[in-house]
Interface confidence: low
């Protein structure tokens, strides 16, 4: 064991170094002192530290630690913030495209339905966007509302064009008949299944990313305990009291101190690992009906098929609905 | 700072998303994110080591500081002495995490449970049933362009997969209203509508 270097007889080095941390020299002793009031940098002999300096060192050590923690998480934080923003935007674009495709389908195939169809399609996709962002909307209700709204227009414009299209009471009857008679066959049910599954997954994916940001932000801004501050001071700054400016902490010692300071934070590890692996599982399953891009961009096609299904069965349906909604129709012609 | 993605080109006339070499789909972007996240899977357990390696620690020096004195780097005293006669490290660990950390752990537990619930087991029966119910109807198969409409002039073609983050200016003339015309806003035409903090390859 080599002998320690002689203490700085004038504390000059310590003073010039401390000045960088705290302008104003009044806290640094002129010459080494016994340091009996020190609580962290317990002296083995004369020391160039005072109680005030010790306090400043503790504050600086905790700040250093906070900055080290922040820089450690910077890349991860950017990664998640960036992707949360990117995916949120991407999903909005998909919804916008899906709406455009559906409107285009109506415009090209059923121009007589367009004004009202555009309105119903718009409302449906607005709800889709809100749902993805966390709104408390029921997907089945959204799909039912779309078909409930579309059917009266299809009936009055395509199946039975002679009827006045402003008839509110027949509209109500038609909305009811739509469900009772399963006018669109199994298509609404099919769309409900696809849309609810894909949107649920999308929504939780975004929620998970936003929670990821919250986790990093929480650990990023942790305030370290006084005990930790003392351990860090002892490791990083107590050597200065002996005039040992250039000496660095031992590696093993640093690890022990850090594990002590980080004990609480490290407890997140198990759940963080699980979070990433669970997110991976979710992402691996995001295909076909669990992929909103796939489902929403194909929706126009399914809606088109559903209208063709209605048209195919138009004769039978018109007769049945004629009987079912006769009361409403009579009142209307009066 | 470079915050924006690449352009994605759309031929508006036929509503066909043009294929741009190497552009990403959303699913590939998701997988890429997971791969990057997995490189941070040990982030919290590795933190103590990371911070030691990013703060001054004796690596090549013969002597190092153990909290009380100058010692030889590989001596027994290098890790041990600094902790003696100080507050108890075990005690520090026993205090448990701060309330904010406990709260965030609870939130993680909750989302993990949700994520697990949502991650369906392999061979999902639903997929099969849906196919039988005619999800992929007509001649427009998986790898082809999906078809809109029946035939003739009413037909519009679209790519089944939207290339990742399609152009932000895309607005069909039937977008929003009975008026059938909507202008794309100047902001939409820009490439930089989000802080991408990096590249979209």
């Amino acid at each position: 064991q080599p002998p320690p270097p002689p203490p700085d007889a004038t504390c000059h080095q310590v003073r010039s170094f401390f000045q960088r941390l705290q302008p104003g020299l009044k806290w640094v002793p002129e010459t080494p002192v016994p340091g009996s009031d020190l609580q962290v940098c317990l002296p083995k002999g004369p020391t160039c530290c005072s109680r005030k300096m010790e306090e400043k060192y503790q504050l600086t050590a905790r700040l250093n630690m906070e900055q080290l923690l922040q820089s450690a998480s910077m890349e991860l934080k950017f990664l998640i913030i960036q992707n949360a923003a990117v995916f949120q935007e991407a999903f909005e674009i998909v919804v916008r495209h899906a709406k455009n495709y559906t409107n285009a389908m109506f415009k090209n195939n059923y121009p007589s339905l367009t004004p009202q169809a555009f309105e119903f399609v718009g409302e449906f996709f607005t709800d889709v966007s809100l749902y993805i962002l966390g709104s408390d909307i029921n997907v089945d209700d959204m799909v039912n509302e779309l078909f409930d709204s579309l059917f009266p227009v299809i009936y009055t414009q395509l199946m039975n064009p002679g009827l006045p299209d402003s008839a509110l009471d027949i509209n109500e009857c038609l909305r009811g008949a739509r469900r009772d008679l399963k006018v669109f066959g199994n298509f609404p049910k099919l769309i409900m299944t696809q849309v609810s599954k894909s949107l649920q997954v999308t929504r939780i994916f975004l929620q998970a990313l936003n929670l990821g940001i919250e986790v990093i932000n929480t650990t990023d801004h942790l305030k370290f305990s006084k005990d930790c501050g003392r351990m860090l001071t002892r490791m990083w700054y107590c050597s200065y009291c002996q005039g040992l400016m250039m000496v660095k902490p031992c590696g093993g010692y640093c690890n022990v101190v850090m594990q002590g300071c980080m004990a609480g934070v490290v407890e997140i590890d198990k759940y963080w690992r699980e979070y990433i692996l669970s997110l991976e599982e979710l992402v691996n399953g995001m295909y076909r009906i669990y992929d909103m891009e796939n489902v929403l961009l194909g929706l126009f096609s399914t809606i088109h098929d559903s209208i063709q299904y209605v048209q195919k069965n138009a004769g039978k349906l018109t007769t049945t609905i004629g009987k079912l909604c006769a009361h409403s129709q009579q009142r209307q012609y009066r | 700072s470079a915050y924006y993605p690449e352009d994605l080109f759309i031929d508006k006339k036929v509503l066909k998303v043009a294929h741009v070499e190497h552009e990403e789909t959303l699913s590939s972007r998701r997988r890429e994110l997971i791969q990057k996240l997995k490189s941070f899977i040990s982030f919290y357990s590795a933190l103590p080591g990371y911070i030691c390696s990013h703060s001054p620690v004796a690596e090549n020096d013969t002597l190092c500081w153990n909290g009380q004195e100058l010692v030889e780097r590989y001596s027994q005293k290098a890790a041990r002495n600094g902790m003696k006669n100080q507050f108890n490290l075990h005690e520090l660990k026993m205090k448990g995490p701060e309330p904010v950390v406990s709260q965030i752990i609870d939130k993680l537990k909750h989302i993990n449970q949700l994520l697990r619930t949502m991650s369906m087991p392999k061979g999902r029966v639903l997929d099969k049933n849906l196919d039988e119910e005619g999800f992929e109807s007509g001649d427009c198969g998986d790898d082809e362009d999906e078809c809109i409409g029946g035939s003739g002039d009413g037909m519009i073609k679209v790519k089944n997969q939207l290339r990742f983050l399609a152009e932000l200016a895309y607005d069909l003339d039937v977008d929003d209203a009975p008026g059938n015309s909507q202008q794309a806003t100047p902001k939409d035409n820009e490439i930089s509508t989000f802080h991408n903090l990096g590249n979209v390859h």
């Epitope: - | 700072s1 470079a2 924006y4 990096g198």
Partner: antibody, heavy 107, light 108 residues
Framework: QVQLVQSGAEVKKPGASVKVSCKAS????????ISWVRQAPGQRLEWMGW????????KYSQKFQGRVTITRDTSASTAYMELSSLRSEDTAVYYC?????WGQGTL | EIVLTQSPLSLPVTPGEPASISCRSS???????????LDWYLQKPGQSPQILIY???HRASGVPDRFSGSASGTDFTLKISRVEAEDVGVYYC?????????FGGGTK
């Protein structure tokens, strides 16, 4: 840690070209785009253009279009900015920047 | 292009006092994903600009918590709760919503 180290100061005659380099270290070079920004004496900061370090795609400010070329060499983790047809008003400090990190500047 | 107008041009402050810098944008910098695409930079004498705040209100790592960013419509504010001697320099706002990226004129 992340560092962007730029090439040294240059003195050029009007009409000439200049090529400034920006060597990146401390992160995966291809993961982030690199912007070039200049600051003429007493003027505000001015964005010149950007390169996607992953695939080499570029975006230039209208003001510099045709005069500026931004390239990169992934094997050397280095980005380059070449400005041609120099004029006296191009006298400035030129910075490269990635995410939130900036180079030290090249006069 | 988006024009950013910063005020004041110069701001003399005594250490320990709060300070506030304003940046007004010629158009909204709020993206539909909820983030404001505005950053704040500090350029100390003889140095490169360094990031303080990104995405309107996110403090960059290593930046003291006396710095904060806020937004109200097209008005953005950088606040320093207690100015320290080391905070001397020129502060710039920068928008990243669309190209060309543009900067404010700076506040000294």
């Amino acid at each position: 840690q992340v560092q962007l180290v730029q090439s040294g100061a240059e003195v050029k005659k009007p009409g000439a070209s200049v090529k400034v380099s920006c060597k990146a270290s401390g992160y995966t070079f291809t993961s982030y785009g690199i912007s070039w920004v200049r600051q003429a004496p007493g003027q505000r900061l001015e964005w010149m253009g950007w390169i996607n370090a992953g695939n080499g795609n570029t975006k230039y400010s209208q003001k510099f279009q045709g005069r500026v070329t931004i390239t990169r060499d992934t094997s050397a983790s280095t980005a380059y900015m070449e400005l041609s047809s120099l004029r006296s008003e191009d006298t400035a400090v030129y910075y490269c920047a990635t995410v939130v990190y900036w180079g030290q500047g090249t006069l | 292009e988006i024009v950013l107008t910063q005020s004041p041009l110069s701001l003399p402050v005594t250490p320990g006092e709060p300070a506030s810098i304003s940046c007004r944008s010629s158009q909204s910098l709020l993206h539909s994903n909820g983030y404001n695409y505005l950053d704040w930079y500090l350029q100390k004498p003889g140095q490169s600009p360094q990031i303080l705040i990104y995405l309107g209100s996110h403090r960059a790592s290593g930046v003291p918590d006396r710095f904060s960013g806020s937004a109200s419509g097209t008005d953005f504010t950088l606040k320093i709760s207690r100015v320290e001697a080391e905070d001397v320099g020129v502060y710039y706002c920068m928008q990243a919503l669309q190209t060309p990226l543009t900067f404010g004129g700076g506040t000294k």
